[in-house]
Amino acid sequence: EKLPKAPVITTPLETVDALVEEVATFMCAVESYPQPEISWTRNKILIKLFDTRYSIRENGQLLTILSVEDSDDGIYCCIANNGVGGAVESCGALQVKMKPKITRPPINVKIIEGLKAVLPCTTMGNPKPSVSWIKGDNALRENSRIAVLESGSLRIHNVQKEDAGQYRCVAKNSLGTAYSKLVKLEVEVFARILRAPESHNVTFGSFVTLRCTAIGIPVPTISWIENGNAVSSGSIQESVKDRVIDSRLQLFITKPGLYTCIATNKHGEKFSTAKAAATVSIAEWSKSQKDSQGYCAQYRGEVCDAVLAKDALVFFNTSYRDPEDAQELLIHTAWNELKAVSPLCRPAAEALLCNHLFQECSPGVVPTPMPICREYCLAVKELFCAKEWQAMEGKAHRGLYRSGMHLLPVPECSKLPSMHRDPTACTRLPYLDYKKENITTFPSITSSRPSADIPNLPASTSSFAVSPAYSMT
């Protein structure tokens, strides 16, 4: 009669390389008496005998994965036990090899000149594929503006008209190569005023021609506003040449007025607008003298009516030709961008933009605006609108307006005063009085595990994007 013998694994498990959808086998040869029970684990979790993805044969000594998936990566162990001595174990790794696969291919993009475009190209494969890009028929070279990111996506900073064209990404590893379909990058250009109308001081009953020239892709349209309303009299002549539109408004002057040229073009569902104003005054008419830097007045606009404190005095910057009109246009343009952002970000961003463009004002000998407290700005930037912030900054720093006005609706947090310096010298935003049940998501940057009263759902992915390519990376 045979003597009992504790199990000994005579063939230790080794690392197995396998391609996706192929068969992978681990062998665990065991000598023992009586015959052992052999169990198998993957990443310390028992593989069930009835799991149809596996085949266990030769009294358990052979484990076969019938069709390898990329999720099968891991450490496999066999454990042999026959009741004599202790159980013995041998472990080996399964490395799933995979030909390159493009899991998120690039898509057609319309992007505005000067912004940042990101063409996605997310890949899978083992070994990790290298990603390169082709524009037209040539390999794309990286430079200070154009970079292939770690993720494989193509990032183009400060997009230029010459970046327009057809692109495809190429994923390559030792097992093969995958190509994406060709996608088109179209570059659009914000409406921009090349020549602003000039102000005139004329005698009663004179004729004046105001001229306004604008450029953009697509070609902008030009409209004229008189004292905030559509022009009621006068004749308009227009001509278009090489994406430049030239508009001339001829007026018979019987009263002074502020005439505003508005150039607009469309980018997808959104519009970009540039605006320039000129005054027509009549000689010897008196006009109100306003402070050279700015003045305090009640907010009479619509966009920020629900955000700003009722009847509060706000600062109007007289470096604009028509401050109230100009600032309202700036906020109106920014407001349109906010329609795309997450519900968490929107009220915070609205409060930030309104309080930045219409700062609380202390009247006096020198009207003084009160900027937002730095800490509140940072909270909007890094907690409420982490994903959206950079996209908005990109647009803001481009300067959508010319003729003495450029759009900078986003404050630079680091330049704002801190609450520590003088708590009364800066504005605290009113956006934070969220009811707890309304807070459903925080960007992942806030904390790895938030407190019990704020659920930490996935971060918002919306952005102030003009197109899917214009996003934060």
């Epitope: 409420f384 707890k436 992942s444 940057i445 904390s447 009263d453």
Partner: antibody
């Protein structure tokens, strides 16, 4: 002048309870956030709990969750830390500290004023 | 939870030396990082807030900076009163974590 004064520390047996108070002056607790931070003998600083009384929102470190409760009485301008089921490892100097603004911005302003601390000893 | 790994745990330096203390966050964090100085038997004092802003009344030889997940406190010229323990602190909405501390001793 901003001041925070803690009280209520002392010797307590394991399983026992204590209530720490943090009396504030020179600012209102309703417009700031109040935090409790502790320091075991010879060890580093450990955050315990925070409250933003204007919104009634609170937060706790995992090590005290379910045992400690932070609260504030704005009429008395005082914050409290109710400590139940005390353990030997809760022995420490407990500081209360404040930060400017509500819970969302307090992290950016830092803990700018601290009390002198009160010693809690949990021992049988 | 986010861990703040502070290094070194202690250092010896002389008056006039430039001293650098680093805190590395275990994952991406906001700039809600502060630095404190603590002397034996005393409460901590705020030096730097929002990663790089100098708290009022703190000497300008103290400065803070950020590079990705690394936060640095620099004392440009160590003074006798600077020998103490320094802590970094990170805030989420709310989850506050402190570094383990760095003891700055006289060489």
């Amino acid at each position: 002048e901003v001041q925070l004064v803690e009280s209520g520390g002392g010797l307590v047996q394991p399983g026992g309870s204590l209530r720490l108070s943090c009396a504030a002056s020179g600012f209102t607790v309703s417009s700031s956030s109040i935090h409790w931070v502790r320091q075991a003998p010879g060890k580093g600083l450990e955050w315990v709990a925070s409250i933003s009384s204007s919104y009634g929102s609170t937060s706790y470190a995992d090590s005290v969750k379910g045992r400690f409760t932070i609260s504030a009485d704005t009429s008395k301008n005082t914050a409290y830390l109710q400590m139940n089921s005390l353990r030997a490892e809760d022995t420490a100097v407990y500081y209360c500290a404040r930060s400017e603004g509500d819970r969302y911005v307090s992290g950016y302003s830092g803990l700018d004023y601290w009390g002198q601390g009160t010693l809690v000893t949990v021992s049988s | 939870d986010i861990q703040m790994t502070q290094s070194p745990s202690s250092l010896s330096a002389s008056v006039g030396d430039r001293v650098t203390i680093t805190c590395r966050a275990s994952q991406s964090v906001s700039s809600a990082v502060a630095w404190y100085q603590q002397k034996p038997g005393k409460a901590p004092k705020l030096l730097i807030y929002s990663a790089s802003s100098l708290y009022s009344g703190v000497p300008s030889r103290f400065s803070g900076s950020r590079s990705g997940t690394d936060f640095t406190l620099t004392i440009s010229s160590l003074q006798p009163e600077d020998f103490a323990t320094y802590y970094c602190q990170q805030s989420g909405v709310w989850l506050i974590t402190f570094g383990q501390g760095t003891k700055v001793e006289i060489k």
